[in-house]
């Protein structure tokens, strides 16, 4: 008889993670007597995958019934493939021997590549908020995919971004890969409702890319603009001064009224008006009993927004000579009327 040949017909096999991989192997003869073994890798460090002779290989099944003597098919199926199973598999015929079986002939090998889906991309923004016109960085990460080829794109409100840098690790061969990308985004005042999207395309996704999103509302701080005005009043001895706090984000805001530099009242913004662009407006007002003042009053609206340094706007309230004459006996405390914010709910 001709000497036995070990035939592995496929040079490579590609399988999706979670599926079974069939590795084909056939012998041209039954001689010599001895077991068939499958290994991953070659040389001294090769890993035993299946031994016809002995052992427990729960993920491996033989495609044919090996107990049939005339069977020359030694193909195996490996279940529940993971990226860690990638490698070159060799079907090897051994001759029965002692103290160990003697390797007789090996097949040429079949390279198993595993197609593994990338994990859902996770997009994270900056740790601290930034104001419009500043640039912030967003990162996108996805892991566990194979093969290495992958495409990542960034979008802001549907418009593709170009200022980003992407790395796929590791650089060399690996069972699976990770991608990390950093995009730089210039903030604008209207970005409270904006979104950045990281989009990943990979062969395993069959044209249906994965997306991860982040809201710019988590990254932006729009500082308020202040306007202090006096409203007309019917009563001669009262002045109504309002502080209009406009176009701020996020909500957290504390307002303090000062009269001639002294704190008269502090309040926290609660009922806000939301603008179309996602920013908020709020109005506070102060009733001043002009009879209580002999001299002109400087009213200051001081706003602390989102834990930042306070901004303020002042208004000089003129006290007429007539009011000065009649109001000397009214105490400063009694001159302050209770106030409430103007405007509807936000």
């Amino acid at each position: 008889e001709d000497e036995l040949q070990v035939i592995q017909p496929e040079k490579s096999v590609s399988v999706a993670a979670g599926e079974s991989a069939t590795l084909r192997c056939a012998m041209t003869s039954l001689i010599p007597v001895g077991p068939i073994m499958w290994f991953r890798g070659a040389g001294a460090g090769r890993e035993l995958i299946y031994n016809q002779k002995e052992g427990h290989f729960p993920r491996v099944t033989t495609v044919s019934e090996l107990t049939k003597r005339n069977n020359l098919d030694f193909s195996i199926s490996i279940s529940n493939i993971t990226p860690a199973d990638a490698g070159t598999y060799y079907c090897v015929k051994f001759r029965k021997g002692s103290p160990d079986d003697v390797e007789f002939k090996s097949g040429a090998g079949t390279e198993l590549s595993v197609r593994a889906k990338p994990s859902a991309p996770v997009v994270s923004g900056p740790a601290v908020r930034a104001t419009p016109e500043h640039t912030v960085s967003f990162t996108c990460e996805s892991h566990g995919f194979s093969p290495r080829d992958i495409t990542l794109k960034w979008f802001k409100n549907g418009n593709e971004l170009s200022d980003f840098q992407t790395n796929v690790d590791p650089a060399g061969d690996s069972v699976s890969y990770s991608i990390h990308s950093t995009a730089r985004v210039v903030l604008t005042r209207g970005d409270v409702h904006s979104q950045v999207i990281c989009e990943i395309a990979h062969i395993t996704l069959q044209g249906d890319p994965l997306r991860g999103t982040a809201n710019l509302s988590e990254a932006i701080r729009v500082p308020p603009t202040l306007e202090v005005t006096q409203q007309p009043m019917r009563a001669e001895n009262q002045a109504n001064v309002t502080c209009q706090v406009s176009n701020f984000y996020p909500r957290g805001l504390q307002l303090t009224w000062l009269e001639n530099g002294n704190v008269s009242r502090t309040e926290t913004a609660s009922t806000l008006i939301e603008n179309k662009d996602g920013t908020y407006n709020w109005m506070s007002w102060l009733l001043v009993n002009t009879c209580a003042h002999r001299d002109d009053v400087v009213l200051t609206c001081q706003v602390e927004h989102d834990g930042q340094q306070a901004v303020s706007k002042s208004y000089a309230l003129e006290i007429s000579a007539h009011q000065k004459e009649h109001g000397s006996d009214i105490t400063h405390e009694a001159a302050l009327a209770p106030t409430a914010p103007l405007g509807g709910s936000g």
Epitope: K53, E54, L66, R69, S98
Partner: antibody
């Protein structure tokens, strides 16, 4: 059903000859290594001879040159031609099938008795 | 030739007992050791091959172990039908050789 049935045993004088047959059913005999094993009365088992799928033959030292193992594929049968028989060859002779890949004995015949006596 | 030495040559045990028979090869035989059971007037029956693999239809109360030169056959819980003679065998190289046998008798 896989089965081996031996025949051809009997009483023979020392120096005489005998041909044992083993008829296989339920499998193709030529696809397996086949063996003869004997057991002298009240004694243990002794391997005698084997024939491989390629027709290669093997014998234990005490029968070399006297016994010949062969097979006839058309009849799916195994044979043991025994010449120059001695009293020490008296035994029950079993036909045995070797296992698929390692030649471990898996199927035994019921045996046939060979008695060498004058 | 490779010699196979079995011990003990005979063994008395009771129903329900766990018994172990050992076999030593005169040189390493990898794990090409087999065990057979034979009852009086009957052909041997194959129990175990490659030291620890059970032949089809053999009950799991039989188990084998070993590699190299030392091998064991264990019967976990003896039943009346298990009283017989047991043989080990090496089949790594010709001539294949058997142990002298262990006769397992009822106590």
């Amino acid at each position: 059903e896989v089965q081996l049935v031996e025949s051809g045993g009997g009483l023979v004088q020392p120096g005489g000859s005998l041909r044992l047959s083993c008829a296989a059913s339920g499998f193709t005999l030529s696809s397996y290594d086949m063996h003869w094993v004997r057991q002298a009365p009240g004694k243990g088992l002794e391997w005698v001879s084997a024939i491989g799928t390629a027709g290669d033959t093997y014998y234990t030292g005490s029968v070399k040159g006297r016994f010949t193992i062969s097979r006839e594929n058309a009849k799916n049968s195994l044979y043991l031609q025994m010449n120059s028989l001695r009293a020490s060859d008296t035994a029950v002779y079993y036909c045995v099938r070797g296992g698929v890949w390692d030649d471990a004995f898996d199927i035994w015949g019921q045996g046939t008795m060979v008695t060498v006596s004058s | 030739d490779i010699q196979m030495t079995q011990s003990p040559s005979s063994l008395s045990a009771s129903v329900g007992d766990r018994v172990t028979i050992t076999c030593r090869a005169s040189q390493g035989i990898n794990n090409y050791a087999a065990w057979f059971q034979q009852k009086p007037g009957k052909a041997p029956k194959s129990l175990i091959y490659t030291a620890s693999s059970l032949h089809s239809g053999v009950p799991s109360k039989f188990s084998g172990s070993g590699s190299g030169t030392d091998f064991t056959l264990t019967i976990s819980s003896l039943q009346p039908e298990d009283f017989a003679t047991y043989y080990c065998q090496q089949y790594v190289s010709y001539p294949y050789t058997f142990g002298q046998g262990t006769k397992l008798e009822i106590k």
